[in-house]
């Protein structure tokens, strides 16, 4: 879902915090992608985003490799990245970026993060000169309280991110419970 | 002009299964969802499940085993199925388009088709 | 599930009334509520999305208010062709529940 034209800017890192403490190992597993915003996000009238799930796997050399898997072209899509710890703990960058083209920043941010049932992390890319971001809503299971939901709405706006811009992708029968 | 009509076998025999077909106009079976919902006499509306515009679906965790639903969108044509039918799945059967994104509302509704399991 | 009530089944008005009609959801649906109207001929038509969002062609009479648990849909100015059941919806959480509906009455 890309509407690039006039993107909302990314805001300063100053005002995205930090999971304090954050613990590599109990982030792993499987997170499903319950709430989903950003400034290439745009909620359509007609049918909704449909729900994702990633999967976090910690390597040897403390690297994720990140999978996420969603329903495209009436099957089961595959997408593998590695995510490369930062500057601290919770921090991540994009490995092997030069693969990517035109691709020249990538940057993750666990926001916050209780691991066994909800976590926010911030996503920060340039591609093609154009700066992005996102923050995912991550849930263990396919639905969070209305409380969770509502602290995802916030923290988004306080980003600068309209309601349009904020959307909680449906449960679907496919791929995400393989 | 959008419309959807149901159209099902009204009588279906305890055990066997019913096939419901929505038959749209006005509008594309790619861009929209269409549900597949039911009132029994007497109760509440029940949503049941549906198939989105991408051909992905989503169903009533509590009826799913029993449930399948397709389409054919150049037909314009949703299919509706449910299995091991009973009395109490005596029903009105609606399909209604998806509408407003993530607000999951539904904007037409067909007239709806009387099934009795007897 | 969720279990959406609406208390009052049948109500009887006078055209011209303003005519307001609940919904109480078993938990918080956080504005995720829609409200249709069922004609006596079976026709359903989408009234009001996310508590308070007016359908295309809905007339300006019809409007919707609420949050948390506790919702309502307003008819100002009652019109005959309002006379039909009213029942609203949950898109907050699967699965997507109804309210078992209130029917209008002519006195």
């Known amino acids: 879902q890309d509407s690039t034209s006039d993107l909302i800017p990314a805001p300063p890192l100053s005002k995205v915090p930090l999971q304090q403490n954050f613990q590599d190992n109990q982030f792993q597993g499987k997170w499903y992608v319950v709430g989903l915003a950003g400034n290439a996000i745009l909620r359509e009238d007609k049918d909704p985003q449909k729900m994702y799930a990633t999967i976090y796997e910690l390597k040897e050399d403390k690297s994720y490799n990140v999978t996420s898997v969603l329903f495209r072209k009436k099957k089961c899509d595959y997408w593998i990245r590695t995510f490369v710890p930062g500057c601290q703990p919770g921090e991540f960058t994009l490995g092997n970026i030069k693969s990517y083209p035109g691709l020249t920043s990538y940057l993750v941010r666990v926001v916050s993060t209780n691991y066994n049932q909800h976590a926010m992390v911030f996503f920060k890319k340039v591609s093609q000169n154009r700066e992005y971001f996102k923050i995912t809503l991550y849930g263990r299971t396919k639905e969070l309280t209305s409380e969770l939901k509502e602290n995802f709405i916030r923290f988004s706006k306080s980003l600068g991110l309209p309601e349009n811009h904020i959307v909680f992708p449906v449960p679907i029968d496919q791929c995400i419970d393989g | 002009e959008v419309q959807l009509e149901e159209s099902g076998p009204g009588l279906v025999a305890p055990s066997q299964s019913l096939s419901i077909t929505c038959t749209i106009s006005g509008f594309s079976l790619t861009s929209y969802g269409i549900h597949w919902l039911r009132q029994p006499p007497g109760k509440d509306l029940e949503w049941l499940v549906v198939i989105w515009g991408d051909g992905s679906t989503t169903s009533n965790s509590a009826l799913k085993s029993r449930l399948s639903i397709s389409k054919d969108n150049s037909k314009s044509q949703v299919f509706f199925k449910m299995s091991g039918l009973q009395t109490d799945d005596t029903a009105i059967y609606y399909c209604?388009?998806?509408?407003?994104?993530?607000?999951?509302?539904?904007?037409?509704w067909g007239p709806g088709t009387s099934v009795t399991v007897s | 599930d969720i279990v959406l009530t609406q208390s009052t089944s049948s109500l009887s008005v006078s055209l011209g009334d303003r005519v307001t009609i609940n919904c109480r959801a078993s938990?918080?649906?956080?504005?995720?509520l829609n409200w249709y109207q069922e004609k006596p001929d079976g026709t359903v038509k989408l009234l009001i999305y996310f508590t308070s969002r007016l359908h295309s062609g809905v007339p300006s009479r019809f409007s919707g208010s609420g949050s948390g648990t506790d919702y309502s849909l307003t008819i100002t100015n009652l019109e005959q062709e309002d006379i039909a059941t009213y029942f609203c919806q949950q898109g907050n959480t699967l699965p997507w529940t109804f309210g078992g509906g209130t029917k209008l009455e002519i006195k």
């Open positions: 938990q918080d649906i956080s504005n995720y």
């Open positions: 209604a388009r998806h509408r407003y994104s993530d607000y999951h509302a539904m904007d037409y």
